[in-house]
């Protein structure tokens, strides 16, 4: 039975040209995390595998940095980066957990972090 929950940074905003950390955390389970995928809509950004390390999608290599931890840092943000991001946790023995983050990239200098929220 899957008992875990994914806690994410929720709805966040950042300035154009800046950077942002996408962060998820799996709690309430003793399952072992074997891999975390980061996706933007249906596009793979990066994978962190417990044995193999990080794979950064070649098209994002210049502006995606691994970490901190299992998170992902997006750099040189553009308004086109606005949208949904997903952290997909592969775990043993539970299976797959998915968290969602919505990022809005703002032209102005007014960019505030949203509250955390949980996806069961």
């Amino acid at each position: 039975m899957m008992t875990g929950t994914i806690e994410t940074t929720g709805n966040i905003s950042a300035e154009k040209g800046g950077s942002i950390i996408l962060q998820c955390h799996l709690s309430s389970t003793t399952a072992q995390v074997t891999q975390v995928n980061w996706e933007q809509q249906d596009q793979l950004l990066a994978i962190c595998n417990a044995d193999l390390g990080w794979h950064i999608s070649p098209s994002f290599k210049d502006r995606v940095a691994p970490g901190p931890g299992l998170g992902l840092t997006l750099q040189s943000l553009t308004v086109n980066d606005t949208g949904e991001y997903f952290c997909i946790y592969h775990t043993y023995p539970d299976g797959t957990y998915t968290g969602r983050i919505f990022l809005e990239v703002l032209e102005s200098s007014v960019a505030e972090h949203g509250a955390r929220f949980q996806i069961p």
Partner: antibody
């Protein structure tokens, strides 16, 4: 088009070392990891290691730690694999291969380099 | 280590036949499986990645399916150039491992 051209066949004595090169063209070299795989005569495929030219980091199959050393020269888009303390059972065709866009698979392969270890 | 077991190890078929090769992983690898074709004296060539995705340039008669531990490569209508050895490979952990190969021969 994407191309990987490997260095020529080598004949080495047991205990010697050999360095195989893999020259890449047709893509941004630093964006894709480079993998090395070997195939002994009449046998299947065995993954050795890969290197990320973007940061120089390598990941090895535990079996080949201390046997294989991977390096890159990004200025000439070339990857290298050095094999040390060669034994007769290291006789194989060694392939370089560019990693995939979506994970740890092998998208484009070099033509292979036959390394023969014989006294 | 994750073991990859292919079956059959060889098969004989005729041009136009539908051919199915299976690959079983010793533990779940989700959909992180690729297939390669190798002809004698040549380097392998990627046919399928992530269990079912075809790289550009690979004919549509090749298809892949499966997830978890059981996977299938299907050639819908075998062509003369398809006689070769086929390998599966997981890309889910270290070490990356290949199946032992399936040789497709002319009947």
């Amino acid at each position: 088009q994407v191309q990987l051209v490997q260095s020529g066949a080598e004949v080495k004595k047991p205990g010697a070392s050999v360095k195989v090169s893999c020259k890449a063209s047709g893509y941004a070299f630093s964006r894709y990891s480079m993998y090395w795989v070997r195939q002994a005569p009449g046998q299947g495929l065995e993954w050795i290691a890969f290197i990320d030219p973007y940061n120089g980091g390598s990941t090895y199959n535990q079996r080949f730690r201390g046997k294989a050393t991977l390096t890159v020269d990004t200025s000439i888009s070339t990857a290298y694999m050095e094999l040390s303390r060669l034994r007769s059972d290291d006789t194989a065709v060694y392939y370089c291969a560019r990693g995939g866009d979506y994970g740890w698979y092998l998208g484009v392969w070099g033509q292979g380099t036959l390394v023969t270890v014989s006294s | 280590d994750i073991q990859m077991t292919q079956s059959p190890s060889s098969l004989s078929a005729s041009v136009g036949d539908r051919v199915t090769i299976t690959c079983r992983a010793s533990q779940s690898i989700y959909s992180y499986l690729s297939w390669y074709q190798q002809k004698p004296g040549k380097a392998p060539k990627l046919l399928i990645y992530n269990a079912k995705s075809l790289p550009s340039g690979v004919p549509s008669r090749f298809s892949g399916s499966g997830s978890g531990t059981d996977f299938t490569l299907t050639i819908s209508s075998l062509q003369p150039e398809d006689f070769a050895t086929y390998y599966c490979q997981h890309h889910y952990g270290n070490p990356l491992t290949f199946g032992q190969g399936t040789k497709v021969e002319i009947k």
